[in-house]
Interface confidence: low
């Protein structure tokens, strides 16, 4: 066959679907690779062809669209499974072509099993709720396009294994689940099961997401530098190791970039000649507040190093702060015998 623009295997779109449930998969060509949509392509006389490679096989095969009850079908740029089977797992290719043009892309589809409590190897989206922030909602994801608006599905919500009924602060409202006041105890996996009829059959869509309760913007503050502070003096003799921790607390802020850095005499450590190393560690609270520690280390400090200015800086979307460390050279202890002798007038 003639040359075809091959976009390869698009592993960025690792599609996972549950076994024995409907799945609708759009050809990624129009969403991510081409500068026109399916309608434009179709009206220009281009044809969309689907084929697949089974798991652990190298052979590309056409997709069988003549299965009983139209189990697999194509509608415009969507490949439909009604429903999926475990052995539908494989790499699927959609190819757009006519006599002069050809473009194709492959993507992996994994059909996964779930247990009675919705546990599975499915990668779960994470939805963050602010702690004690008033009513917040999550919506049953990725159910658009499965049934027409005239169909009224039934939706059942679960937290972990348990149907959400008579929960104190969590109320199912159709496709939405409302949290009256989110608390740490609301952390967990939430599943909506959408049941709808189609051509005399009943289908189920299972969607699970992880809820993580995080710090509220109402409580957010600019970065707080716990160390260095005014109470600790780093007193060293030349030749000793100088270790100064910079410990900074950051309130959780959605999409904020938290930064900590040191300056020595106003310059970044990379821009000066002294042999300095910086080690960083990060820890998080249950509400994803962050504590960053950067330890500045000079293995063998010189008397010049002990005269420099060491400043810890921190920045978040809430503001920027800085704090200088108190560094000084240790005064040598008096040589006791000599001073004693001098005190008695000895020469």
């Amino acid at each position: 066959s003639e040359r075809c623009d091959d976009w390869g295997l698009d592993t960025m779109r690792q599609i996972q679907v549950f076994e024995d449930e409907p799945a609708r998969i759009k050809c990624p060509l129009f969403e991510h690779f081409l500068k026109f949509n399916y309608s434009t392509a179709h009206s220009a006389g281009l044809t969309l062809i689907w084929y697949w490679t089974r798991q652990d096989r190298d052979l590309e095969e056409p997709i069988n669209f003549r299965l009983p009850e139209n189990r697999i079908s194509k509608e415009k740029d969507v490949l439909w499974f009604r429903p999926t089977l475990l052995n539908d797992t494989g790499n699927y290719t959609c190819m757009l072509r006519n006599t002069t043009y050809c473009s194709k892309v492959a993507f992996p589809l994994e059909v996964v099993q779930k247990d009675s409590c919705f546990n599975s190897p499915m990668k779960l989206p994470v939805h963050k709720l602010y702690i004690e922030y008033g009513i917040q909602r999550i919506t049953c994801p990725n159910v658009d396009g499965y049934f027409p608006s005239s169909v009224k599905p039934t939706i059942t919500w679960y937290m972990g294994c348990y149907k959400i009924q008579n929960f104190n602060n969590v109320i199912p409202e159709g496709m939405n689940l409302s949290f009256l006041i989110a608390l740490i105890s609301n952390n967990g996996n939430y599943t909506c099961v959408v049941t709808y009829p189609e051509n005399g059959r009943t289908f189920h869509l299972t969607r699970t997401l992880t809820v993580k309760v995080v710090g509220s913007p109402k409580n957010a503050v600019p970065p707080v530098i716990h160390s260095p502070n005014d109470h600790v003096v780093y007193e060293k003799e030349p030749g000793e190791e100088l270790l100064i921790p910079c410990t900074v607390y950051f309130s959780f802020l959605m999409d904020s970039r938290n930064e900590v850095w040191w300056t020595i005499d106003g310059k970044k450590p990379d821009d000066i000649t002294i042999d300095v190393t910086i080690n960083e560690s990060i820890s998080h609270s249950r509400t994803e507040d962050e504590t960053r520690t950067q330890i500045l280390s000079i293995k063998k400090v010189t008397s010049e190093d002990l005269k420099r200015s060491y400043v810890c800086h921190a920045r978040s979307a809430k503001g920027e702060v800085a704090k200088a460390a108190k560094v000084k050279q240790k005064v040598p202890a008096p040589r006791y015998t000599v001073e004693l002798a001098c005190g008695f007038g000895a020469t």
Epitope: L86, N119, S120, P121, G160, C161, Y162, T210
Partner: antibody, heavy 121, light 113 residues
Framework: EVQLEESGGDLVQPGASLRLSCAAS?????????MCWVRQAPGKGLEWVAC????????IYYATWAKGRFTISKASSTTLYLQMNSLRAEDTAVYFC?????????????WGQGTLVTVSS | DIVMTQSPSSLSASVGDRVTITCQAS????????LSWYQQKPGQAPKLLIY???TLASGVPSRFSGSGSGTDFTLTISSLQPEDFATYYC?????????????FGGGTKVVIK
């Protein structure tokens, strides 16, 4: 040849910590593999410890007795760990790593040869 | 806690004998059939014989068979061979949220009469 190999077993004192590793060769864990640790005390039966879905970081399960002291984790598509803290004499056992492929309910079709952990003062 | 009770705990048999081992779970296994059987010889790792209560694992001789559903299961060796003298374990899989995911039976040691 497809195999799992455990390492890290040792003689330690009560209260100590130990990290066991399980390295896969000839395969890498697929996202639907259920990777587990199972132990066997000398002369006794098999006892489940913990499991993790290879394709997930949230689907982690522990035996009731192991919660809090033992941590299962996965470093890559070929390495599984078991971090054991506050070890007790009754944790003395051969620790096996085992894989259940592609589906729940299919049993553990691949086992390592085991690594011996002895907790004694 | 889930308990898997295997019986007998040991049995003496001769080559050619038909051997039956039972396994009872204190609650139904997931999907009524998520039960596996293993064979273990001294100093070796367990070997999968049967999964999904009755499906023979790859490479396992057809003299081994499994049956049962829910809480009661049976492993049968139709004609015991010299290499079959070993310890046999059942293993159930359960809903991970309400209980331990996995539990093993105490084992049945098959020895030469």
């Amino acid at each position: 040849e497809v195999q799992l190999e455990e390492s890290g077993g040792d003689l330690v004192q009560p209260g100590a910590s130990l990290r066991l590793s399980c390295a896969a060769s000839g395969i890498s864990f697929s996202s639907s593999d259920f990777m587990c640790w199972v132990r066997q005390a000398p002369g006794k039966g098999l006892e489940w410890v913990a499991c993790i879905y290879a394709g997930s970081s949230v689907s982690i399960y522990y035996a009731t007795w192991a919660k809090g002291r033992f941590t299962i984790s996965k470093a890559s598509s070929t390495t599984l760990y078991l971090q054991m803290n506050s070890l007790r004499a009754e944790d003395t056992a051969v620790y096996f790593c085992a894989r259940s492929t592609g589906s729940v309910g299919r049993g553990f079709n691949l086992w390592g040869q085991g690594t011996l952990v002895t907790v004694s003062s | 806690d889930i308990v898997m009770t295997q019986s007998p705990s040991s049995l003496s048999a001769s080559v050619g004998d038909r051997v039956t081992i039972t396994c009872q779970a204190s609650q139904s296994v997931y999907n009524s059939n998520h039960l596996s059987w293993y064979q273990q010889k001294p100093g070796q790792a367990p070997k999968l014989l049967i999964y999904s209560a009755s499906t023979l694992a790859s490479g396992v001789p057809s003299r081994f068979s499994g049956s049962g559903s829910g809480t009661d299961f049976t492993l049968t060796i139709s004609s015991l061979q010299p290499e079959d003298f070993a310890t046999y374990y059942c293993q159930g899989e359960f809903s991970c949220v309400s209980a331990d995911c996995i539990a093993f039976g105490g084992g049945t040691k098959v020895v030469i009469k």
